[in-house]
């Protein structure tokens, strides 16, 4: 059995992250998609997607904006104002049920710390952006994940693009999907 | 392995019709869009159209030089693509290959071996 | 439509040295960041070959004395030091937009 390998993203408080998932195939194009963070075992859907999704329809939920492109397989998250507590793990998911998500990407490990002065400043509102492509290395998530990979981040001036190496992943086979439950 | 093999290419008279197919294998057929390419002896490559899955409704885009001529369909049943060409012109003449894309608006990752068609009286 | 237009038409570079391809898009060819812009490399008598995918992606297999860059509507195919078997024809190719159109195409020989 594989297992999701999370990715570590370390941001000051006050910057803005965000994350394009890239989700290709045309049967999740009119699906609903959701932005949830693992809590324990459990994931929290912090926002989700209308249905059906249409192109430039921004869903913003309190510091969170969702945009679809449907067209073009992409869904662009963007938390600003990121703060302290948001630390965590999250995930890109299509949301086709109630009670399931087939969850696509592997984890995002956010690690938000305070600035040297204590409090984001206008020189911290940075955006570093993620760029998530599908996992073909994927199982249920459990208590343990493998080592995350840390990416830096650059001075807080500066804008980061992070890439997720690698070709693109031919989805053939369903168990490339990885099904978890949701719990709203 | 993904495979595509075009065939049903041949001599044809203009005005004319022709129906190329194109076997796929080695993939879920049924979730990847299609499209077909062309390209006439010692010229430059040229998109004809492509037919999306069902969940899109099969939907279908063509390149302005064929549309209304051409028309593109699937079979999900048996893994195959075609090309149903109809008012057939000299320029048209060309190797007609059949292309599969990675995804919504995605690189054409697999490509056939081609098949030709002459338009000639 | 979009049209690429590549340059040069042909280029002619001694081995082991670089080549550069040029694609110029009448539009940007870019959704959410997305550049949705391809190359291929083709031999007489083969069908294209995928070599980079979204401007700068190396395909799998592929060697990466190739790369890709680019966003927006200006893209450049690179060939880091040119081997023998890199003679061939290179096309840019868009996505973004329906009709999906290819640039005319980009001779490549030895010098």
């Known amino acids: 059995t594989t297992e999701l390998t999370e990715e570590k993203y370390e941001y000051k408080e006050g910057q803005t992250l965000e994350v394009k998932c890239d989700y290709a195939l045309e049967k999740y194009a009119n699906s609903r998609k959701a932005w949830q963070k693992m809590e324990g075992k459990m994931p929290k859907i912090l926002a989700k997607t209308e249905r059906p999704s249409e192109n430039s329809h921004p869903v913003q939920v309190g510091r969170i904006t969702l945009e679809d492109y449907p067209d073009h397989g992409l869904l662009q998250v963007q938390m600003t104002n990121l703060q302290v507590e948001d630390s965590g793990l999250y995930q890109c998911v299509i949301y086709q049920h109630p009670k399931e998500s087939h969850v696509l990407f592997n984890p995002i490990c956010l690690v938000v710390t305070k600035g040297s002065s204590g409090t984001p400043g206008s020189s911290e509102n940075s955006t570093q952006n993620v760029y998530r492509t599908p996992s073909t290395t994927a199982k249920a998530l459990g208590p343990r994940y493998t080592s995350p990979r840390t990416v830096t981040q650059a001075p807080p001036e500066s804008t980061v693009v992070v890439s997720t190496p690698g070709s693109e992943i031919n989805l053939t086979n369903v168990t490339d999907i990885i099904r978890v439950p949701v719990f709203n | 392995e993904v495979q595509l093999v075009e065939s049903g290419g041949g001599l044809v008279q203009p005005g004319g019709s022709l129906k190329l197919s194109c076997a796929a294998s080695?993939?879920?057929?049924?979730?990847?869009?299609m499209h077909w390419v062309r390209q006439a002896s010692g010229k430059g490559l040229e998109w004809v159209g492509r037919?999306?899955?069902?969940?899109?409704?099969?939907?279908?885009y063509y390149a302005a030089s064929v549309k209304g001529r051409f028309t593109i369909s699937r079979d999900d049943s048996k893994n195959t693509a075609y090309l149903q060409m109809n008012s057939l012109k000299t320029e048209d003449t060309a190797v007609y290959y059949c292309?599969?894309?990675?995804?919504?608006?995605?690189?054409?990752?697999?490509w056939g071996q081609g098949t030709l068609v002459t338009v000639s009286s | 439509d979009i049209v690429l237009t590549q340059s040069p038409d042909s280029l002619a570079v001694s081995l082991g040295e670089r080549a550069t391809i040029n694609c110029r898009a009448s539009q940007s060819v870019d959704t959410a960041d997305y550049s949705f812009l391809h190359w291929y490399q083709q031999k007489p008598g083969q069908p294209p070959k995928l070599l980079i995918y979204?401007?700068?992606n190396l395909e799998s297999g592929v060697p990466d004395r190739f790369s890709g860059s680019g966003s927006g509507t200006d893209f450049t195919l690179t060939i880091s030091s040119l081997q023998a078997e890199d003679v061939a024809v290179y096309y840019c190719?868009?996505?973004?937009?329906?009709?999906?159109?290819f640039g005319q195409g980009t001779k490549l020989e030895i010098k």
């Open positions: 190719q868009q996505s973004n937009q329906d009709p999906y159109t």
């Open positions: 037919i999306r899955t069902k969940s899109s409704n099969y939907a279908t």
């Open positions: 979204r401007a700068s």
């Open positions: 080695g993939f879920t057929f049924s979730t990847y869009a």
């Open positions: 292309t599969r894309d990675m995804g919504i608006r995605r690189q054409f990752a697999y």
